[in-house]
């Protein structure tokens, strides 16, 4: 069971990143699915290595004081959403903006029907060029 | 099937990074090989988690305007070279140069005879000290 | 065999990061254990994908000239400690400090009783908020 999906620019104002089965994507079988273009949902309980990579372009003067944060989050059936992993990068002083990449990854126990998704502080700063921003998992 | 190879400084002017089976490297068996010191080639079709880490040292004034980009690329038999993953980091203002690390990783379907390699915008900026820059894969 | 442990602030002056089985941690069975809150120790020989993520907050003026370096290290029975992976990030000019995240990961052969741990140049700069700093492995 494995998946690798590709970022998709979105007109939505949500902080949850959008993904698509496009380009050199992976969706091994129907035991993992991409739901609503925003979350990877698994049908089998078990240990999964889950990862996300986010490339963004920001400028210190044009951004809020707070850093750019990418969060890998979990929604299990009958449970509240929770953060699994976070990474933070301070905005660049480069103009018009400076690109930076964040990589998150870890091993987590998922229940049947559990969904994982990626949140960012400012989706408008995310880079969607080939290979820059992606999201995936593999069952151990 | 798994491999982990270590960066090697090169006098070549190519943007493709060079690797060696040295230090604490891994080469599980002959179903994955390091070819010409530049690419990992697999003999078996399947899903692979492929990763690379690149540490580099650069300075904004001494570098081009463009960020430092590391790309994980694929060459499959009978197909053309393509990008799987990219990461970008804007150059540091630290002098003489500021070190930064990039990590790439994802799950991809590889065909028999497929090769993966790592491209960077400026190989002369790459750090080759122990553990700083490496490249590997594992078959799921 | 898999583990994922969560960073723990420590009053110790050691450069070795401290970890705990807390939050959304993983410890699949007793073939991998967290020893002294500082190292993951495996009982079985084999290939492991080992990873660490470290988020830190530093300022160029308040830090040494040297970059922030995170190292993944190995101690095998009857062998000296050695570095497996390192990543480096130059300190930010943001005030009071600028957050940055480092991700390390690779495939390594471990012997029975081998331990892996994470060293950083300045543990006081490490961020311990939910999901920011973690450490884990999985047996292939």
């Amino acid at each position: 069971i494995a998946a690798h999906v590709i970022s998709e620019a979105s007109s939505k104002t949500t902080s949850v990143l959008q993904w698509a089965e496009k380009g050199y994507y992976t969706m091994s079988n129907n035991l993992v699915t991409l739901e609503n273009g925003k979350q990877l949902t698994v049908k089998r309980q078990g240990l999964y290595y889950i990862y996300a990579q986010v490339t963004f372009c920001s400028n210190r003067e044009a951004s809020s004081q707070a850093p750019f944060i990418a969060s890998l989050c979990l929604k299990s059936p009958g449970r509240f959403e929770r953060i699994l992993l976070r990474a933070a990068n301070t905005h660049s002083s480069a103009k018009p903006c400076g690109q930076q990449s964040i990589h998150l990854g870890g091993v987590f126990e998922l229940q049947p029907g559990a969904s994982v998704f990626v949140n960012v502080t400012d989706p408008s700063q995310v880079s969607h060029g080939t290979g820059f921003t992606s999201f995936g998992l593999l069952k151990l | 099937i798994a491999a982990h190879v270590i960066s090697e400084a090169s006098s070549k002017t190519t943007s493709v990074l060079q690797w060696a089976e040295k230090g604490y490297y891994t080469m599980s068996n002959n179903l994955v090989t390091l070819e010409n010191g530049k690419q990992l080639t697999v003999k078996r079709q399947g899903l692979y988690y492929i990763y690379a880490q690149v540490t580099f040292c650069s300075n904004r004034e001494a570098s081009s305007q463009a960020p430092f980009i590391a790309s994980l690329c694929l060459k499959s038999p009978g197909r053309f070279e393509r990008i799987l993953l990219r990461a970008a980091n804007t150059h540091s203002s630290a002098k003489p140069c500021g070190q930064q690390s990039i990590h790439l990783g994802g799950v991809f379907e590889l065909q028999p005879g497929a090769s993966v390699f790592v491209n960077v915008t400026d190989p002369s900026q790459v750090s080759h000290g122990t553990g700083f820059t490496s490249f590997g894969l594992l078959k799921l | 065999i898999a583990a994922h442990v969560i960073s723990e602030a420590s009053s110790k002056t050691t450069s070795v990061l401290q970890w705990a089985e807390k939050g959304y941690y993983t410890m699949s069975n007793n073939l991998v254990t967290l020893e002294n809150g500082k190292q993951l120790t495996v009982k079985r020989q084999g290939l492991y994908y080992i990873y660490a993520q470290v988020t830190f907050c530093s300022n160029r003026e308040a830090s040494s000239q040297a970059p922030f370096i995170a190292s993944l290290c190995l101690k095998s029975p009857g062998r000296f400690e050695r570095i497996l992976l390192r990543a480096a990030n130059t300190h930010s000019s943001a005030k009071p400090c600028g957050q940055q995240s480092i991700h390390l990961g690779g495939v390594f052969e471990l012997q029975p009783g081998a331990s892996v741990f994470v060293n950083v140049t300045d543990p006081s700069q490490v961020s311990h908020g939910t999901g920011f700093t973690s450490f884990g492995l999985l047996k292939l």
Partner: nanobody, 116 residues
Framework: EVQLLESGGGLVQPGGSLRLSCAAS????????MAWVRQAPGKGLEWVST????????YYADSVKGRFTISRDNSKNTLYLQMNSLRAEDTAVYYC?????????WGQGTLVTVSS
Amino acid sequence: EVQLLESGGGLVQPGGSLRLSCAASGFTFARYQMAWVRQAPGKGLEWVSTISDDGDSTYYADSVKGRFTISRDNSKNTLYLQMNSLRAEDTAVYYCAKLDKLFDYWGQGTLVTVSS
């Protein structure tokens, strides 16, 4: 239906320059990596260059590095190959290619002949 129409080929002397164009239609051009490949008389297809969808990353075969430049204009759905310092061994039919997951699509090609 994917269509790729190459143009700009011709006869040129060694050391000369040419600019090839490839007009793309039938797909969302800006979402795909693109490449130039070539086939010399009596030889197999040879990869020349690849460009990312955003144009930020470019890759070249060692044989053309420093002489050829790949670029794209996503607003015009067009791929380009600027070829300088041409050599006799660059003589070939040049094809532009759309890089998809399962297949690489390419056009009819344009002939480049380098001869004095």
